[in-house]
Amino acid sequence: EICGPGIDIRNDYQQLKRLENCTVIEGYLHILLISKAEDYRSYRFPKLTVITEYLLLFRVAGLESLGDLFPNLTVIRGWKLFYNYALVIFEMTNLKDIGLYNLRNITRGAIRIEKNADLCYLSTVDWSLILDAVSNNYIVGNKPPKECGDLCPGTMEEKPMCEKTTINNEYNYRCWTTNRCQKMCPSTCGKRACTENNECCHPECLGSCSAPDNDTACVACRHYYYAGVCVPACPPNTYRFEGWRCVDRDFCANILSAESSDSEGFVIHDGECMQECPSGFIRNGSQSMYCIPCEGPCPKVCEEEKKTKTIDSVTSAQMLQGCTIFKGNLLINIRRGNNIASELENFMGLIEVVTGYVKIRHSHALVSLSFLKNLRLILGEEQLEGNYSFYVLDNQNLQQLWDWDHRNLTIKAGKMYFAFNPKLCVSEIYRMEEVTGTKGRQSKGDINTRNNGERASCESDVLHFTSTTTSKNRIIITWHRYRPPDYRDLISFTVYYKEAPFKNVTEYDGQDACGSNSWNMVDVDLPPNKDVEPGILLHGLKPWTQYAVYVKAVTLTMVENDHIRGAKSEILYIRTNASVPSIPLDVLSASNSSSQLIVKWNPPSLPNGNLSYYIVRWQRQPQDGYLYRHNYCSKDKIPIRKYADGTIDIEEVTENPKTEVCGGEKGPCCACPKTEAEKQAEKEEAEYRKVFENFLHNSIFVPRPE
């Protein structure tokens, strides 16, 4: 029987009975927060073979092994993960071994086994046989291996029953418990699973099978399950569901959503039965089961009960995340805030239509309205007193409305009002009149020419760049010397630059009046020689990266018709030269035969250009004779090794108290002081642990139902 859509067993161990008839859990399995130690020996669920999402165990007292509970659990698919993990075992106080001796495949995701004080048999499991990539596994804070003394079946009797593999250059027996080996298939099967008798399964099987080369005898399917068969793709008139099986249209149409009772039901899209249309698609009608592409961002209508939504903080803006149509009025009143422009863009940047009016007042933190980057229509169905549908009053630092070269905004009904915006040039307001179609609607007092733009360089001349030179991490630029009517009014220049992967940045991007600015700024003094063109060397840049650069002249307030003259350049886009890439990441090598090595790696984090090829070099290493010198099965103490990281056991220090210079060749030595990089790595590691623990607690601690 298929159980789902996720099973959460907590507080009472007898809830485990819910798993009695499950062969597949379509969803996750949580077993957690059982604080009273119980005897789990009477609980056994041999039918359970597959969990399609993840398995999470957290604080279950008295549970010593999972092997008795789930003796036939073969596959955890990881279709959805718990914080990137398909198997999480966290703070299991009494767990002594994992014991999932039939677990053969974790299809997606990594494992996290942390803070299990009594847990052993971790180093004896070769996770690379179960997962594709082990580099993201996190196994920390469990019982130290030295205290475990893990022995695989038959080792003590010198009749080892388990097979050996190499992990971290250590060739050893692989087992789950003292009496259960880790199953390995013959190399002839390649990536295929195998039966208990080591016969290769059908390629469509995953984990195991009851008969060789038969797609109806699989324990689990590599791709999809339909009508008793493992199939590479779902047959006609059936649809992929939950990443593992094929269902028909009727089944899909009648699934009750686990997340919400009032949801519109599942949809069929691109051969899959899914809870809602994917990003960029919308239902073809409210009762439809099919999706069509959205034109632009997908519409989401948001409505304010009180008609007017006041945006006075990031928190209030957050409520509008994803909204494309806002039914009501927007009152923006942002006096202060941290990184406010980019935060507002994040939450309000998709709004295209406001049905009522927009009022911006006392928003001293705003330099531009470009955070409303998709606003194209103000309907003005409701207007302020005086018939205003766009009202801008007393915004001390507002310099730009929108980039009118790339913006179409229509105000369907109502007038505009602008007053006491000292840095907003009147020319900017007039331009808005033209673009929005409101020219002629405003009366004389609606746009105050005296108190708008009184403290801004409104009549801007254009500065022209004269030369640009690049290297891998530097850009040299020069520009024409600006000559204002009175040369004494020119103080200096300011160069603004930032990374710009695309040629779509504006001067006001990410800028607010509270110090946040996505642009780097450098002041450039005037060259003493009047004939020398001003310029700058920008250094410390990234190789093969496109930068946007513009220059502003810093001038004295020279009043001419109540306005200040200034100058600035257009935005220039320039790419630094390519450089040597950083080292390839996560290099792993494994031998799959006596004459072959398989080497895998991930691309470098900094390609510094277009990668065209990799060079792989190898050389033969002499065999380490040290491995043969000691009988590891004897009860004697294993000889002390030189630890790579310079750490040693306390007991060894007490035996041998003399210290030596770091890096000495003889015996133990003191720990070298940690490098800055190591300290940083430790800090990040601790931070990562905290983030995961917070995520875990936030996910599983829920209010008790009424």
Partner: antibody, heavy 122, light 107 residues
Framework: EVQLVESGGGVVRPGGSLRLSCAAS????????MSWVRQAPGKGLEWVST????????YYADSVKGRFTISRDNSKNTLYLQMNSLRAEDTAVYYC???????????????WGQGTTVTVSS | DIQLTQSPSSVSASVGDRVTITCRAS??????LAWYQQKPGKAPRLLIY???GLQSGVPSRFSGSGSGTDFTLTISNLQPEDFATYYC?????????FGQGTRLETK
């Protein structure tokens, strides 16, 4: 234990009506499509009708279309076959059967009831 | 509609024999064919699904093969309890259809 028990069979005159029921137990009834299959005396098996797990889709053999209606009550774990305008050729043992897989309606039948006899005779 | 034709319509065999029954579809049905066993006065019992899948609880002496239009049911080492009527059924498309049946009787 998975079990299906049919009831409601009997003798009826041509043109008459009958309602068969099938009580299910031992499995999650709403997850599986269910079918009716009949067998005339001394003849082979003939599929009559199938209904999806939710009851949202129904399928009929041409010989019964418009006369028979399949339905289910998932809260009562019961399958029904309403038979109207009965003919002599409808005389048969009627079996209710559970489809093998969950998630689709077109499948093989892995659990069968013991059958109930319908006789249409004047 | 898809027609299924079974052959032979009846077959005589002895305990220990190997028996093969064939089923031919009027059009391709991929591998969506099942085999049932029925004894007099009893309900049918599913033996094989998807042409070759052995239903749980069915002895391994029963096996199925084929795809497209031609399918076979093989019973190796015939046992006394195997004497019955066998039907094939297609689950490729509605309407579902059965073969006319093959009677397996003792020689």
């Amino acid at each position: 234990e998975v079990q299906l028990v049919e009831s409601g069979g009997g003798v009826v005159r041509p043109g008459g009506s009958l309602r068969l029921s099938c009580a299910a137990s031992g499995f999650t009834f709403s997850s599986y499509a269910m079918s009716w299959v009949r067998q005339a005396p001394g003849k082979g098996l003939e599929w009559v009708s199938t209904i999806s797990g939710s009851g949202g889709s129904t399928y009929y053999a041409d010989s019964v279309k418009g006369r028979f209606t399949i339905s289910r009550d998932n809260s009562k774990n019961t399958l029904y076959l309403q038979m109207n305008s009965l003919r002599a050729e409808d005389t048969a043992v009627y079996y209710c059967a559970k489809e093998r897989g969950s998630g689709w309606s077109l499948d093989n039948m892995d659990v069968w009831g013991q059958g109930t006899t319908v006789t249409v005779s004047s | 509609d898809i027609q299924l034709t079974q052959s032979p319509s009846s077959v005589s065999a002895s305990v220990g024999d190997r028996v093969t029954i064939t089923c031919r579809a009027s059009q391709g049905i991929s591998r969506w064919l099942a085999w049932y066993q029925q004894k007099p006065g009893k309900a049918p019992r599913l033996l094989i699904y998807a042409a070759s899948g052995l239903q749980s609880g069915v002895p391994s002496r029963f096996s199925g093969s084929g795809s497209g239009t031609d399918f076979t049911l093989t019973i190796s080492n015939l046992q006394p309890e195997d004497f019955a009527t066998y039907y094939c059924q297609q689950a490729s498309s509605f309407p579902i259809t059965f073969g006319q049946g093959t009677r397996l009787e003792t020689k």
